[in-house]
């Protein structure tokens, strides 16, 4: 007899996980030399080891920590991307300015880009038909609590100048609820962290105003002086220059603002 | 246990190629790169490339490229060097070894010699 | 391509004593850097990865350390089976590149 399953409001553990998953750190170690020590095999065992037997909706950073430690990976001081809503262009920049690193060109964000996955209370099985939505059903789910849980390592270990890209169409430039404000900003390191710059992505070709006067960006700033990080703001009224500057910063045309 | 067994010695001919064998075993052979070293007497370790099992990519070291050709046998859980156009200076052990914990076979003994 | 220099090519110790063992790499390579032992007859064997983290079932004696471009294999208490060769090797780009190595003997 078929066993009743549980029915959430989210969808359900990606098809092919633990093939995704491994394959991904596979290819990770092929891509980024500096991290063959890390034992593809033991990776796994502990993402799995985070979510596998254990009610859903009951999920803490704590069982993700075995996970991290395997993942454990630093960033050059000035180096950190972080980003909100607009995680295409971060992604397209850093593809370009190797240099710099968003959560997802690490280890574990990238092990973890896009997918969902959830198991079952008592059982060793993964749910494919459906996982807990962070509104609908509950906020401690295992795809939350992992994002939470590595923003918060992503943010901790970022020092010099830390750099973010927000998107300039949303209602809310700033948003107190996303990771970005709600793990990122509170996790930096005044210690460690000099300043944060924030870079207002522009949507319309036509929109030259200043989004660094907008009030959600003025609280952003309120919040990170409080910290004792000096902010900075920048709009980027062109993105799509913006990508093309960093690929040819010797183009006459860059010479100009974007 | 990990084991990567690799195959015997050869003698060959100046000019002509051979195909090196490590058979991987006690673990999931497309879960770890595999890479390939070589050691010459007095000359200490050379690394020639790397292969991924799974998608069969490769990363060569560019003072091999043409010399080594990597590949896998997913079924038989085995990867292979082809080293083509021979010459003495090809004359080494050859070593593969496995990324993460550093397993490394037991090595292949290659004499070019006419 | 990374050049990793072993200056030392021997080096010679007592039974009980002391030894450091040191490569310099031509440029930043972070803490990318592995060691290996290579017992006379046999394959390199890894004992330290990432600069300073030592592989399950190497002795304690065994204790890497350095980033960026000097590192440092210190073998403490030497042992008569510690005689090898030591290699460094540098993965933080590719082509990996080693050091020509330092033979150690036990006098």
């Known amino acids: 007899l078929p066993r009743w399953r549980q029915q959430w409001s989210g969808s359900g553990t990606t098809s092919r996980f633990p093939e995704t998953v491994l394959a991904r750190c596979v290819k990770y170690t092929e891509v980024h030399p500096e991290m063959r020590h890390v034992d593809c095999q033991s990776v796994w065992d502990a993402f799995k080891g985070a979510f596998i037997s254990k009610y859903p909706c009951n999920i803490t950073e704590e069982d993700y920590q075995p996970l991290v430690k395997l993942g454990t990976q630093t960033v050059p001081c000035n180096k950190t991307l972080l980003w909100s809503r607009i995680k295409d262009l971060a992604h397209q920049f850093t593809q370009v300015q190797r240099d710099m690193f968003t959560l997802e060109d690490m280890l574990l964000g990238y092990l973890a880009d896009d997918l969902t996955w959830c198991g079952e209370f008592n059982t060793f099985e993964i749910n494919y038909q459906s996982c807990p939505d962070w509104r609908k059903d509950c906020s401690n789910n295992p795809v939350s609590v992992f994002w939470k849980t590595v923003s918060r390592r992503f943010a901790e270990t970022a020092c010099g100048v830390v750099h973010v890209m927000l998107n300039g169409s949303r209602s809310k430039i700033f948003d107190k609820n996303s990771t970005f404000g709600s793990v990122e900003v509170h996790n930096l390191q005044p210690e460690k962290v000099q300043a944060l710059e924030a870079w207002v992505i522009h949507g319309g070709r036509e929109d030259s105003r200043d989004l660094c006067q907008d009030p959600t960006i003025k609280e952003l700033e309120s919040i990170i002086s409080k910290r004792n990080i000096r902010f900075f703001c920048k709009n980027i009224y062109r993105p799509d220059k913006f990508l093309q500057c960093v690929k040819n910063p010797e183009d006459s045309s860059c010479l100009s603002g974007i | 246990q990990v084991q990567l067994q690799q195959s015997g010695p050869e003698l060959v001919r100046p000019g002509t190629s051979v195909k090196v064998s490590c058979k991987a075993s006690g673990y999931a052979f497309t879960t770890y790169l595999v890479e390939w070293i070589k050691q010459r007497p007095g000359q200490g370790l050379e690394w020639i490339g790397v292969?991924?099992?799974?998608?069969?990519?490769?990363n060569y070291n560019e003072k091999f490229k043409g010399k080594a050709t990597l590949t896998v046998d997913r079924s038989s859980t085995t990867a292979y060097m082809h080293l083509s156009g021979l010459t003495s200076d090809d004359s080494a052990v050859y070593f593969c070894a496995r990324y993460a914990y550093g397993y490394w076979g037991q090595g292949t003994t290659l004499t070019v010699s006419s | 391509d990374i050049v990793m220099t072993q200056s030392q090519k021997f080096m010679s110790a007592s039974v009980g004593d002391r030894v450091s063992i040191t490569c310099k790499a031509s440029?930043?390579?972070?803490?990318?850097v592995a060691w290996y032992q290579q017992q006379p007859g046999h394959s390199p064997k890894q004992l330290i990865y990432s600069a300073s983290n030592r592989y399950t079932g190497v002795p304690d004696r065994f204790t890497g350390s350095g980033a960026g471009t000097d590192f440092t294999l210190t073998i403490s208490n030497i042992q008569s089976e510690d005689l090898a060769d030591y290699f460094c090797?540098?993965?933080?780009?590719?082509?990996?590149?080693f050091g020509s190595g330092t033979k150690l003997e036990i006098k």
């Open positions: 292969i991924n099992p799974g998608s069969g990519s490769t």
């Open positions: 090797q540098q993965y933080s780009t590719y082509p990996f590149t």
């Open positions: 440029q930043n390579v972070g803490t990318a």
